[in-house]
Structures are given as C-alpha cells and as structure tokens.
C-alpha cells in the first residue's frame, strides 16, 4: 500500500486498518511450580501468572492451562526469558572426580501447537551448556522473534528442567506475545 | 474491532487510529559513566547518549537525567543490552585459595518510576553469576518485554556495578522503548 | 498527532496511515554455511533461509546474497540469535598448560550497509568470552533493538567464526526485522 493514502471519499473503501490499542497482547510472569517427576527427553511446559502484578492479557488473547491462545491470524512478536539457577552442576562434580566432563545444559523452547497438526512446532530455542565452578549459579536465557500465526494456535514455553527455573520474581522469568 | 472496517462515512467517527511514524520511540546508547557513590543493595542507574550516532528520541519521548520519560499511556516494548567486562572474578580467586566459592554476579534491571507511587517497580531483570576462569571476561545481558505504561512514567536501567559496564561501543550497550 | 482524531471529512486529508499487514517483515533461519576465506579482523556474514519452514519475507522486504534489503524508510525492530557450539576452548587448553589464559570469544554483529556510505555501520553487537571447562560447550547470543533505516539499506549478520555456528535447527539461529 506504499504511496496509497487513506483519504476519505464518498465511496466505501475497506482498508484493513485497526486501532493499535485493540490488538491481542499478553505478558505473563512466572509462578512457583515444582515437578514431582519429569519424563526423560520430554520438556515440561511452564505455568504462568496472567493477571496480577505486571502480568496481563488483553483483546481476546487468553491464557489457559499453560497455553497462550492466539485469537486472530497475523504476525506476532513472541518473547520469553527464563532465569535458571542451581547448585554446583553435575559437570563440575564429574570434573573434580577426574571423569569425562560432559556438561549439563539448560534449554528454553517456545512451542506452537496447532490442533490440526499432529506435531508441535518449535519456534524458538535457547540452549546453553552449564559447567559452573561456583557452588551456586544463575543465568537467564532470552528469546524473541516474529512469527506468522493462525487463529487458534497455542503457544507454550518448555524448559529442560522445571526445578532449575527461578520463580522468585516476576521480572526474572516471563513470556509474552503481541500482534504486530 | 475485529471485522470492523474503518470506512469513511459522512458521520463523524472518532477511531483511535494514528500514524505509526508519530509514535513515541527512543534508542539510547552507552556513554562513559561517572561512577557515583551508591548505597549498598541499591543499583546505580546508567546515563545514556540520546542524539548522536545510532541514538535518537522522537515524538515526545524525551531523555533526561538517566530517565526515559513516557509521554503517553499505552503498551510499550522496552529493551536493553548491557555488556559487562572485568578481570578474573573474585569467585575465581576465592576458589583458587580453597575457600568457599561464592560467585560474583552481574545484574541489569529495567526500572519504572511513577511519581505518585513511592517505590520503583522492577520491570525486567537479567542476572548472572560470574565465576570465570579466564583472566579477562566479557558478556552481554539482554532484556526485552512489553509493559503497560502511563503518561509520566519514567524508565531507567540499573546495573549491579557501573565499573564493569563496557561503554566502548554504542552497539554493545543500549536501551530503548517504543509504543506499540 | 496526539489528540488528533482521524475523522472522515469532505476535504482531502492525507494521513500517513497504513495497514499493519502490509508492512515489510522478514524472519530468516539458519542454513548450513560454506566457510569462506575471510581476512583477519573481518567477520564473515551468515547466509539464511528465507522461504522454507519458519522463514519468510513479505511486503517487499527481500533477502538476497546474505542481505536483507530495506524497501522503505522508517523505524525497524531488528533481531538475531546465533547459537554457537564448540569443543573445549583454546582458553581451557592454555590454562591447563599453565600459560596465560587469554579467553576465546564469540561475537555476533548486526551490520547495516548503505551504498552511499563507504563504511558499514555496526548496529548491534553481542560478544562473549568463552573459557569453558566442559569438553563440549554451546550457548546463544541474542540481540534486538530499534533503528531508523533508509530505503535501500542492507542488513547482514556477521559472526566471529562461522565454524562455531549451530546450523542444525531453524529455532536456534535466526535473523529478523520488521517495520514498526
């Protein structure tokens, strides 16, 4: 539409304009959660706060059961930060014992689920080896990018180990999306 | 407003449409800091370049005295990267001496100040333990998310230790916000 | 334009409104790189997938020969993540040999090229020392910020060492931009 001006005229023109303030948007913040167990090679999804403190959902962007539900098709910017923390990593212990030092790792995945499609789609992944020397370690993984989503798509954040997620503050671990 | 078209008509319709180019926006870049005395457990704020090089403020988004001033209420995407660098961390020295290895850390906080509210609000935090083995280390912390802000709110970036901030290049350490 | 409503009237008003869906946008994903010879202190550019899987370009935002071509002037949000991986870093080997432990590093730069300007402009840089103890290490560097670009500007992503880039998955290493 470059160079085309939206000038009022007497003929009916249907331009797909919309008020920015009415676009679907969400910013979710961490809540405390601890796994009783987790299956090998299956990354658990995080649960989020959606209405208290800094968290909000608006304009038909709804949060339910670990999922952000996309209410209309379009291009969305999606982001998440997960702060991990732990005691001395296994890698460090192994190293001290003089055995091969396979590093531990921490991973965040933002996943899209489309009901009509059998397999979830991994949109974004941040993964980092952790081989810390200090007794306590902590660090964030941040992700953000733009994706074309369809109405009804669902977004979730999966992590390699829920028990390492820092759930102590809403500004440390969060998840959001907004229609561009 | 999904499905509602903004079609010109003869009756006065006040649709909250606005030109994207007129939205408040800022990208600030690092300048050399003057380390100021600060109280224990209180992170100092960075000050920024707002008009030279890559830096700019526009459409009533103003920078003054370490703060970005929000000129109108709405949902903003806010981001910052701070690159830190230092010599061997204390943690490393302690470890070599065989004492308990409490890690050092580096932290960035994007803070909102609302004059009518007594306490600043921490919007985003990136915090990382630093227990480096190498003699010189450097690394960035990146943050970005969407928040609902009110006209008159002020944003700043606080860091755990100003003396560790890499101020050498405008592309390494920066701070920005834009109205969605 | 705060307070000015875009109300239809009988006089011709040219308001710079445009449909959000028609704005230039791109999300590019990693492909296997062909390491090219590059001069010392000159970081090679990555090339990208622009149409398969999660990758797309739209509304005159074109990808050609490692560059994203900016089709119209305006403020763009630009982002990239590069995941690096490697074997034990040189720093670690040097340390074990008892020599001075200069750390290795990994660096990502988002660069703007303007034909009328002789030197490329570094918009964003993420750089990190790597001095890992584990035998295999991997970690992402994420960058994102807003810049004022001109029609015809070209964007590329440069890295310190192409051979360390993880090209195995489209969600690990990516590059995108969109007009705000």
């Amino acid at each position: 539409l470059k160079g085309q001006e939206f000038a009022p005229s007497h003929q009916q023109v249907y331009a797909p304009l919309r008020a920015d303030g009415d676009k679907p948007r969400a910013h979710l913040t961490v809540v405390r959660q601890t796994p009783t167990q987790h299956f090998k090679n299956q990354f658990p999804a995080l649960h989020w706060e959606h209405e208290l403190g800094l968290a909000f959902t608006k304009n038909r962007m709804n949060y339910t059961n670990k999922f952000l539900l996309i209410p209309e098709s379009g291009d969305y910017f999606i982001y998440s930060q997960v702060t991990f923390r732990g005691m001395t990593s296994e890698c460090s212990e192994i190293r001290q014992a003089g055995r091969p030092n396979k590093p531990d790792s921490i991973t965040v995945v933002i996943t899209k689920v489309t009901d009509s499609y059998p397999e979830p789609t991994q949109l974004l992944m941040g993964t980092k080896s952790v081989c810390e020397v200090g007794s306590n370690w902590f660090q964030p993984i941040y992700l953000g990018a733009m994706f074309s989503l369809q109405e009804g798509d669902k977004l979730m954040v999966n992590v390699s180990d829920i028990s390492l997620v820092d759930y102590t503050k809403e500004d440390k671990t969060f998840f959001g999306a907004f229609l561009l | 407003l999904k499905g509602q078209e903004f079609a010109p008509s003869h009756q006065q319709v006040y649709a909250p449409l606005r030109a994207d180019g007129d939205k408040p926006r800022a990208h600030l870049t690092v300048v050399r800091q003057t380390p100021t005395q600060h109280f224990k457990n209180q992170f100092p704020a960075l000050h920024w370049e707002h008009e030279l090089g890559l830096a700019f403020t526009k459409n009533r988004m103003n920078y003054t005295n370490k703060f970005l001033l929000i000129p109108e209420s709405g949902d903003y995407f806010i981001y910052s990267q701070v690159t830190f660098r230092g010599m061997t961390s204390e943690c490393s020295e302690i470890r070599q001496a065989g004492r308990p290895n409490k890690p050092d850390s580096i932290t960035v906080v994007i803070t909102k100040v609302t004059d009518s509210y007594p306490e600043p609000t921490q919007l985003l935090m990136g915090t990382k333990s630093v227990c480096e083995v190498g003699s010189n280390w450097f690394q960035p912390i990146y943050l970005g998310a969407m928040f609902s802000l009110q006209e008159g709110d002020k944003l700043m970036v606080n860091v755990s230790d100003i003396s560790l901030v890499d101020y050498t290049k405008e592309d390494k350490t920066f701070f920005g916000a834009f109205l969605l | 334009l705060k307070g000015q409503e875009f109300a239809p009237s009988h006089q011709q008003v040219y308001a710079p409104l445009r449909a959000d869906g028609d704005k230039p946008r791109a999300h590019l994903t990693v492909v296997r790189q062909t390491p090219t010879q590059h001069f010392k202190n000159q970081f090679p550019a990555l090339h990208w997938e622009h149409e398969l899987g999660l990758a797309f370009t739209k509304n005159r935002m074109n990808y050609t020969n490692k560059f994203l071509l900016i089709p119209e002037s305006g403020d763009y949000f630009i982002y990239s993540q590069v995941t690096f991986r490697g074997m034990t870093s040189e720093c670690s080997e040097i340390r074990q040999a008892g020599r001075p432990n200069k750390p290795d590093s990994i660096t990502v730069v988002i660069t703007k090229v303007t034909d009328s300007y002789p030197e490329p402009t570094q918009l964003l840089m993420g750089t990190k020392s790597v001095c890992e103890v584990g035998s295999n290490w991997f970690q992402p560097i994420y960058l994102g910020a807003m810049f004022s670009l001109q029609e015809g500007d070209k964007l590329m992503v440069n890295v310190s060492d192409i051979s360390l880039v993880d090209y195995t998955k489209e969600d690990k290493t990516f590059f995108g931009a969109f007009l705000l």
């Epitope: 809540v31 959660q33 009783t36 208290l52 102590t168 | - | -």
Partner: antibody, heavy 119, light 108 residues
C-alpha cells in the same frame, strides 16, 4: 507414588516439647517446599508454617501463634521434614499434617499425627 | 494476612442438585495459589481443585472451580451421596498461608 508419613505425635503436658517427623517418598524432596498444617478437634484447618527448598535458601515462615515456639527443619539427605514444638499449650492440641508445597500444581498430604497437650 | 471468607457456612441440598460455594479473599490472590479441599470426618483433606480451576488427578468432572482476584467459586454440578462433607478453600500465595473457615455441605 507420593507418600508422606507423619510420626512423633502423642500426649504431652503443657510447657513440654515434642518433635514430629514426616518421611517423604515418591518425589524429589529437595526441590519442594514443605508445610505443616494442623486441625484442632472439631475445628477448621490452620496453617502452621513452611520451609523452603535449599535452593530458595531454606527459609522458614510461621503463623503468629507458634512463632518462637515451633521450628521447622528438613534433612534432604534423608527425605525428612521435622517440626520441633516447644512450650506447648493446650490450644496446640490438634492433628498435625505435613504437606508438599509445589506452588502451582497438586500438593499432597500425609495422614496426620495427633498431638494432645493436657495436664 | 489474607482472610478467606467462605459462604454459606452450611449448605443443605439433595443428591442430584447443584452446589455452589464461594470463597472471598480480603485482597487479591493469584489464582495459581488457590485450592479447594474436601474433608470427611476422620480423614485428611483431599485436594479437589488447584490453581483455582484445575482438577486434581482422579477428581470427577462434576467438580469445578473458577474465579480470580478476590472472588472464587467451587461448583459441584450434580451432587452424589459421597459429596456431602466439609469443603475448604486455601490460598498460599502470600505468607501466612490461610484457609477459609469451611462450608459444610449436608443432605437436605
């Protein structure tokens, strides 16, 4: 299967002391915050206190009436939660339950142990 | 301290009827940390609903929860004879954790 088994209850005189234990199994005990809750005969449920996981500094919190008299501790190596009760009062008579505190998610209760404070 | 007030104190209904219990908080509570329990005489409480609206493992779908902020509701869509018991809400978002005083659901 998650199991919590309380023990150590019994009859004690006012001013006396008692130590309750809770043996946990079926989950990673060290990750989980733990609570004690009590229920006086014929009354409602009352939260007694909580201990956080070691990674969250292992700090404790108590309800006002027991502060300074009761102490919660944990031994992650033995998957055991303890409640040391000193200066007991008749109003401390209750069934004491240990409960997992996983934050969002399903929490589990033991079967309870009866503490009777009477002269 | 967050005070939880349950109403009614006692609810007399017949099997097959719908039961609606209320739990009101003195200040906003994260729905993530709001749970409902059922307790029968001589037994430990049984978790029915966590996160204000999620059914615990093995809980029949006639039990449901809803609400946010300060107002939470627990519903049994169609009462079965074994549902007559005392029901408690609890918040554990802020210390001290608190319980409601309980609602006794009795056979009419």
């Amino acid at each position: 299967e998650v199991q919590l088994v309380e023990s150590g209850g019994g009859l004690v005189k006012p001013g006396g002391s008692l130590r309750l234990s809770c043996a946990a199994s079926g989950f990673i005990f060290s990750n989980v915050w733990m609570n004690w809750v009590r229920q006086a005969p014929g009354k409602g449920l009352e939260w007694v206190g909580r201990i956080k996981s070691k990674i969250d500094a292992g700090t404790t919190d108590y309800v006002a009436p027991v502060k300074g008299r009761f102490t919660i501790s944990r031994d992650d190596s033995k998957n055991t939660l303890s409640l040391q009760m000193n200066s007991l009062k008749t109003e401390d008579t209750a069934v004491y339950y240990c409960i997992t505190d996983r934050g969002w998610g399903e929490n589990y209760w033991g079967q309870g142990t009866l503490v009777t404070v009477s002269s | 301290e967050i005070v939880l007030t349950q109403s009614p104190g006692t609810l007399s209904l017949s099997p097959g009827e719908r039961a609606t219990l209320s739990c009101r908080a003195s200040q906003s509570v994260s729905s993530s940390y709001l749970v409902w329990y059922q307790q029968k005489p001589g037994q430990a409480p049984r978790l029915l609903i966590y996160g204000a609206s999620s059914r615990a493992t093995g809980i029949p779908d006639r039990f449901s929860g809803s609400g946010s902020g300060t107002d939470f509701t627990f519903t049994i869509s169609r009462l079965e004879p074994e549902d007559f018991a005392v029901y408690y809400c609890q918040q554990y978002g802020g210390s001290p954790y608190t319980f409601g005083q309980g609602t006794k659901l009795e056979i009419k």
